[in-house]
């Protein structure tokens, strides 16, 4: 069964910088990745980035750079311009569209106890939705 994992990391040097890492553990060919915040894509979440395997990537503020880390995982760098650091309490969701499996989505957030430079534990987050 495919799984999607999500990790959110705060940069040790810049407390206003965050990186969201997402990956797909499964046998399918990935056709599109969508990253959103505030909830799942299409269910109250706001799109931050879309990554297409061939056509490239597109991101929207406050996302800074979306990139493929491997052929089955991506990372999204975020720049928090506000002093209140809303990212610390935000849920980030990643949806992987895969052939022939369909769509798989999972969400994660920065652990409340996170020190700068630390990340969420590297375990797959339960899948929220499979279309």
């Amino acid at each position: 069964t495919p799984e999607v994992w999500v990790q959110v990391q705060m940069e040790a040097t810049e407390l206003s910088s965050f990186t969201v890492h997402c990956g797909f553990l499964g046998p399918g060919s990935i056709s599109l990745v969508t990253v959103s915040w505030g909830g799942p894509d299409g269910a109250g979440g706001t799109k931050l980035a879309v990554l297409h395997p061939e056509l490239g990537t597109r991101q929207w503020a406050p996302a800074r750079q979306a990139r493929w880390e491997t052929q089955s995982s991506i990372s999204l760098a975020l720049e928090d311009s506000g002093a209140s650091s809303p990212f610390a309490n935000t849920t980030f969701c990643c949806k992987f569209a895969s052939f022939p499996e369909g769509s798989w989505e999972s969400c994660g957030s920065l652990p409340p106890s996170s020190d700068p430079g630390l990340s969420a534990p590297p375990t797959p987050v339960p899948i929220l939705r499979a279309d």
């Epitope: 060919s29 990139r67 491997t70 052929q71 995982s73």
Partner: antibody, heavy 123, light 106 residues
């Protein structure tokens, strides 16, 4: 330019485990995945799995699932591949390689490669 | 799993010959195909990535083509240092290598 240097040759008994290391130097280690590939004597190349050091999550080939563990230590820029329940068929040269890509597309390839570590399984 | 079938498994050729190696995937892999060269006792070396892009430092006599399921590596004029084993690799769903093609001196 990143260079990968692997640990030395090992001789192991059937049923035991082996842990091979791969140290990166001359470039960023955390953000690029490290893959492990093996090659039995006179045979072809076989991908075993990979890891993204910055998140510590590994992906494994189905054939090796449950028998191989890939880990990484960011502080020393070193990746490890541990293979358990060794049998004679596991005698091979084990290579680490960097999963290299453009970032903006999903194209990935292996470059550079480590020099290889010969693991011999014999009673 | 995606299977990669290379042909021929071995071939004999002379210096100056044009050599063609083919690789077939068991399902469509778009252009997620790489080619490597390996010499005895050495680690593989990347030649071509993304089906047709020449890796920096690799001589222009090497070229790659194809998409979907059928791919080709061509050496336009074989040189003495080209006698080696060549592998294709798909990178669409995880990674799989072809069985290899050994290019020997005729």
């Amino acid at each position: 330019q990143v260079q990968l240097v692997q640990s030395g040759a090992e001789v192991k008994k059937p049923g035991s485990s082996v842990k091979v290391s791969c140290k990166a130097s001359g470039g960023t280690f955390s953000s690029a995945a490290i893959s492990w590939v093996r090659q039995a004597p006179g045979q072809g190349l076989e991908w075993m799995g990979n890891i993204i050091p910055i998140v510590g999550i590994a992906n494994y080939a189905q054939k090796f699932q449950g028998r191989v563990t890939i880990t990484a230590d960011e502080s020393t820029s070193t990746a490890y591949m541990e293979l358990s329940s060794l049998r004679s068929e596991d005698t091979a040269v084990y290579y680490c390689a960097r999963d290299t890509g453009r970032g903006y597309t999903r194209h990935f390839w292996f470059d550079p490669w480590g020099q290889g570590t010969l693991v011999t399984v014999s009673s | 799993d995606i299977q990669m079938t290379q042909s021929p498994s071995s071939l004999s050729a002379s210096v100056g010959d044009r050599v063609t190696i083919t690789c077939r995937a068991s399902q469509s892999i778009s252009s997620y195909l790489n080619w490597y060269q390996q010499k005895p006792g050495k680690a593989p070396k990347l030649l071509i990535y993304a089906a047709s892009s020449l890796q920096s430092g690799v001589p222009s006599r090497f070229s790659g083509s194809g998409s979907g399921t059928d791919f080709t590596l061509t050496i336009s004029s074989l040189q003495p240092e080209d006698f080696a084993t060549y592998y294709c690799q798909q990178s669409d769903i995880l990674y799989t290598f072809g069985g290899g093609t050994k290019v020997e001196i005729k």
